[in-house]
């Protein structure tokens, strides 16, 4: 018959306060004959949570079936977990004697904590846009946990990041904690799309690990770059030109037209389109009058992109002689 | 259903043998301390043998060298051999399975009579 | 040998009695006492292990108490049934020993 071993698989078992907790222990060897008992605590001290072979203990009920000759399992179910309850359980093995049963082997303990699951982390951007090729700070905090390891991770697309700060507060013992971390994140152009993620993994969370996220487009600015052009067929006695606006987010922006300094309200049609970055394109169309018109007109697209300063293009309008002298029905 | 049945018990004169049976049906023999119990007529009880789980044996004192527990585990069954029997033997014997962890008695047989007599 | 001594030895109790049966161990048994009760012609029937723990089948109305060396069965309320010799046995330790029995009879 092979020496009796107390196993005791957990070194800790974390538990949530009202929830039931189960204490494993198994034996390798039926003998010596004599019960099993659990206590918490270590020495003269120790507290008696259940015994196999008498007492009643209403919060305490065994996983197996004890009357069963062939049982080797003496692992056991606390109810109603308060945080008067944590400790160090023990499982340990009594030979029957008289006056009293001889302690004969005790498992290894397993320590109950209270545990508690981090809130969602909650990711913050920065308060103003940025543009790409500079560097954003992005917060994540969670609250609430327990015990206080825990493991923080910043990814960006899927890509785990680098440059961050993480702390857990407090430092000394309590019995909740809150983490807070800051990433520094460079900003590329095709950011709009992009997201960064925090994410929290503890062990209450069993493997499953909270995810807090932010999309990069709430703290990107891409900056348009402008295209001034002439189109070179003429309609009638107009020439049309196109300022075309590229790759730009946010959406906002206000274009206006000048000819020759003044003003124009007369922007004859515009479209926007998304790019497949998240970024937008928005091309407006000028039709300029010709007829009367002397050689050296200059138009100027300008915009303003997001509350930035504005930006603008000038066009000095070819007008040649042939185009002049275009009628407006002639047909090429 | 877990039960115990004795056989084997009988007449023998002074100085003989006998060899008790006790058949488990129910349960594993081998898994439980097992117990021989005897009971002279219109006397008390008397512990007589036992054999644990691990095969270790003892015996009472008025017995011990002339009586040998012993198992068959194939068989599922229990045996009492009882040598150099004497007078003082004759009583009904009772084969008891030994509890779960304390090895308190659970259940017993319905005995055999064993008679020493010339 | 651990010496268990039962009293008394007879009982003659009415249907509807409370009557207590005691057991005394030479030396200190812990709790490893059992109780039993044999009818005539009949096997013993296990009652009480640990001193006060029923097995199962067996109605309330039987319990046990005590520790060390000093037992007590008691019955609550006698029925027809009840009336038997009742055994206590001490099993801390080989030789198992039994008392001498306590025979209840009808009054």
């Known amino acids: 018959e092979e020496e009796l071993q107390m196993i005791q698989p957990e070194k800790l078992l974390l538990v949530t306060v009202g929830k039931t907790a189960t204490l494993h222990c198994t034996v390798t060897s039926l003998l010596p004959v004599g019960p099993v008992l659990w206590f918490r605590g270590v020495g003269p001290g120790r507290e008696l949570i259940y015994n196999q072979k008498e007492g009643h203990f209403p919060r305490v009920t065994t996983v197996s079936d004890l009357t069963k000759r062939n049982n080797m399992d003496f692992s056991i179910r606390i109810s109603s977990i308060t945080p008067a309850d944590v400790g160090t359980y023990y499982c340990v093995k009594f030979r029957k004697g008289s006056p009293d049963d001889v302690e004969f082997k005790s498992g290894p303990g397993t320590e109950m904590a209270l545990g508690a699951k981090p809130s969602a982390p909650v990711v913050l951007g920065p308060a103003a846009r940025t543009t790409p090729e500079h560097t954003v700070s992005f917060t994540c905090e969670s609250h609430g946990f327990s015990p206080r390891d825990i493991t923080l991770k910043w990814f960006k697309n899927g890509n785990e990041l680098s440059d961050f700060q993480t702390n857990v507060d407090p430092t000394g013992q309590s019995v909740a904690y809150s983490i807070r971390s800051t990433a520094r994140v460079v900003l590329d152009p095709w950011d709009v799309r992009s997201q960064v993620i925090c994410e929290v993994a503890h062990v209450t969370l069993q493997g499953d690990p909270l995810r807090g996220t932010a999309n990069l487009s709430e703290a990107i600015r891409v900056p348009p770059t402008l295209e001034v052009t002439q189109q070179p067929m003429r309609v009638g006695n107009q020439v049309n030109v196109t300022c075309q606006v590229r790759k730009f987010y946010p959406q906002s922006l206000q274009l206006t037209w000048s000819e020759n300094g003044n003003v124009c309200q007369r922007e004859t049609a515009s479209t926007l389109t998304e790019n497949k970055d998240g970024t937008y394109n928005w091309t407006s169309w000028f039709l300029v009058n010709i007829s009367d018109q002397r050689d050296d007109v200059v138009l100027t697209c300008q915009v303003k992109h997001d509350g930035q300063l504005a930006v603008s293009k000038r066009l000095a309008l070819e007008v040649t002689v042939h185009q002049k002298d275009q009628s407006s029905d002639a047909t090429p | 259903e877990v039960q115990l049945v004795e056989s084997g018990g009988g007449l023998v004169q002074p100085g003989g043998s006998l060899r008790l049976s006790c058949a488990a049906s129910g349960f594993t023999l081998s898994s439980y301390d097992m117990h021989w119990v005897r009971q002279a007529t219109g006397k008390g009880l008397e512990w007589v043998s036992a054999?644990?789980?691990?095969?270790?044996?003892y015996y009472t004192g008025s017995v011990k060298g002339r009586f040998t527990i012993s198992r068959e585990n194939a068989k599922n069954s229990l045996y009492l051999q009882m040598n150099s029997l004497r007078a003082a033997d004759t009583a009904v014997y009772y084969c008891?399975?030994?509890?779960?962890?304390?090895?308190?008695?659970?259940?017993w047989g319905q005995g055999t009579m064993v008679t020493v007599s010339s | 040998d651990i010496q268990m001594t039962q009293s008394p030895s007879s009982l003659s109790a009415s249907v509807g009695d409370r009557v207590t049966i005691t057991c005394r161990a030479s030396?200190?048994?812990?709790?490893?006492l059992a109780w039993f009760q044999q009818k005539p012609g009949k096997a013993p029937k296990s009652l009480i292990y640990t001193a006060s723990s029923l097995h199962s089948g067996v109605p309330s109305k039987f319990s046990g108490s005590g520790s060390g060396t000093d037992f007590t069965l008691t019955i609550s309320s006698l029925q027809p049934e009840d009336f038997a010799t009742y055994y206590c046995?001490?099993?801390?330790?080989?030789?198992?020993?039994f008392g001498q029995g306590t025979k209840l009879e009808i009054k």
């Open positions: 054999i644990g789980t691990a095969g270790d044996t």
């Open positions: 008891v399975r030994g509890g779960v962890w304390d090895d308190a008695f659970d259940i």
């Open positions: 046995q001490q099993y801390v330790s080989y030789p198992y020993t």
């Open positions: 030396q200190d048994i812990n709790n490893y």
